[in-house]
């Protein structure tokens, strides 16, 4: 008789999830010499241990602590780029500006990027059919808790000037409910972080508005200022030119506003 299985509202675990995590770990440790000591099998065991046999609506940050310990990585704290709702451009930027890091440029972020996973209470099975949706089912699900945990740690590690890339095409350029707005902003350490510099990325070719004056940016400024961190904001009117100028900063057209 087939066992009853909980039906969740979100997509199930990404197919070949164990193989993908292990392969990504091996690839990352090969590319990053400072992480060559990492035992990828142990990393997978710790990852699996965080959610297997546990109710997928009852996951805690403590569940991920063994994985956090194995994935400990020192990133230059003054080279951190946060992002919200504009992941692709942020990743394109750090691929060019190699000394800067998004969360997904770290081992743990790289392992889990774009993946979904969950298990089932009291069985060692991975659920490939469905996983809890953050809104419709529960917030303490394996994926959400993972990103909350690594995002908090990433923000806590930051120092000096921290940059955040924000999507100027969205109705809420700064969204208090995003990972950046709900986790990272509140875990920047005022004694370490001097300034948060927001880069607002414009979508339209002819968009010359100063999006740094947007009400949601003013809200971000207020939150940051109350935490005694300085705030700065820049419009990136031409993201294509912005990336080009990161690649070729000596280009004569790169002195003008981008």
């Amino acid at each position: 008789v087939p066992r009853w299985r909980q039906q969740w509202s979100g997509p199930g675990t990404t197919k070949r999830f164990p193989e993908t995590v292990l392969a990504r770990c091996v690839k990352y440790t090969e590319i990053h010499p400072e992480m060559r000591h990492v035992d990828c099998q142990s990393v997978w065991d710790a990852f699996k241990g965080a959610f297997i046999s546990k109710h997928p609506c009852n996951i805690t940050e403590e569940d991920y602590q063994p994985l956090m310990k194995l994935g400990t990585q020192t990133v230059p704290c003054n080279k951190i780029l946060l992002w919200s709702r504009i992941k692709d451009l942020a990743h394109q930027f750090t691929q060019v500006q190699r000394d800067m890091f998004t969360l997904e440029d770290t081992l743990l972020g790289y392992l889990a990027d774009d993946l979904t996973w969950c298990g089932e209470f009291n069985t060692s099975k991975i659920n490939y059919q469905s996983c809890p949706d953050w809104r419709k089912d529960c917030s303490n699900n394996p994926v959400s808790v993972f990103w909350k945990t690594v995002s908090r740690r990433f923000a806590e590690a930051a120092c000096d000037v921290v940059h955040v890339m924000l999507n100027g095409s969205r109705s809420k350029i700064f969204d208090k409910n995003s990972t950046f707005g709900s986790v990272e902003v509140h875990n920047l350490q005022p004694e370490k972080v001097q300034t948060l510099e927001a880069w607002v990325i414009h979508g339209g070719r002819e968009d010359s508005r100063d999006l740094c004056q947007d009400p949601t940016i003013k809200e971000l400024e207020s939150i940051i200022s109350k935490r005694n961190i300085q705030f700065s904001c820049k419009n990136i009117y031409r993201p294509d030119k912005f990336l080009q100028c990161v690649k070729n900063p000596e280009d004569s057209s790169c002195t003008s506003e981008i």
Partner: antibody, heavy 116, light 111 residues
Framework: QIQLVQSGSELKKPGASVKVSCKAS????????MNWVRQAPGQGLEWMGW????????TVADDFKGRFVFSLDTSVSTAYLQISSLKAEDTAVYYC?????????WGQGTLVTVSS | DIVLTQSPASLAVSPGQRATITCRAS??????????MHWYQQKPGQPPKLLIY???NLESGVPARFSGSGSRTDFTLTINPVEANDTANYYC?????????FGQGTKVEIK
């Protein structure tokens, strides 16, 4: 290039007040907080605190609370240190130094002498 | 407050030799692998000059003869080889936890 230029030496009598200025150039003033550091004659360095140049919020170290006030005039990219009710033991060189918590940029220092 | 203790208080070194100054913090100054300990050189009548930030990063324009190492509570500034114009006071400073604090200084003299 980044520069912090402080006001000149001051000779004051006990009980008087003094205001030391620190004018910044070569960067966006409101992007980096300004620290104040004291060095008494022949002594080491003491961090007095800092001022958030974006909000104007001062953070004063416990040993300097009361008579020491940090202020700003962002229109001229200048930070100020005011000391009231001066005492002989306030005699020192006062430095401004730009954040972050490691100080790559310092003013040249302002000697404040308190003597009757 | 985090107390920083430098040793030795003074040091006399011949040109071409190695000078080593240590700084011990009363508690860890590390945060996620980054150490918030910095080193300065100060010559008479001048403001301090940043040499090393975050334990081991050489400030731009500072000769590679200067190097820093250490983590958590124990840190070292090394000058190798020492030159005649390295005569100065050297200070460590932490920015892990307010109030920022400095070591009491080490006076380096060239024989």
């Amino acid at each position: 290039q980044i520069q912090l230029v402080q006001s000149g030496s001051e000779l004051k009598k006990p009980g008087a007040s003094v205001k030391v200025s620190c004018k910044a150039s070569g960067y966006t003033f409101t992007n980096y907080g300004m620290n104040w550091v004291r060095q008494a004659p022949g002594q080491g360095l003491e961090w007095m605190g800092w001022i958030n140049t974006y909000t104007g919020e001062p953070t004063v170290a416990d040993d300097f609370k009361g008579r020491f006030v940090f202020s700003l005039d962002t229109s001229v990219s200048t930070a100020y240190l005011q000391i009231s009710s001066l005492k002989a033991e306030d005699t020192a060189v006062y430095y401004c130094a730009r954040n972050p918590g490691w100080f790559a940029y310092w003013g040249q220092g302002t000697l404040v002498t308190v003597s009757s | 407050d985090i107390v920083l203790t430098q040793s030795p208080a003074s040091l006399a070194v011949s040109p071409g030799q190695r000078a080593t100054i240590t700084c011990r913090a009363s508690e860890s100054v590390d945060n996620y692998g980054n150490s918030f300990m910095h080193w300065y050189q100060q010559k008479p009548g001048q403001p301090p000059k940043l040499l090393i930030y975050r334990a081991s990063n050489l400030e731009s324009g500072v000769p590679a003869r200067f190097s820093g190492s250490g983590s958590r509570t124990d840190f070292t500034l090394t000058i190798n080889p020492v030159e005649a114009n390295d005569t100065a006071n050297y200070y460590c400073q932490q920015s892990h936890e307010a109030p920022w604090t400095f070591g009491q200084g080490t006076k380096v003299e060239i024989k």
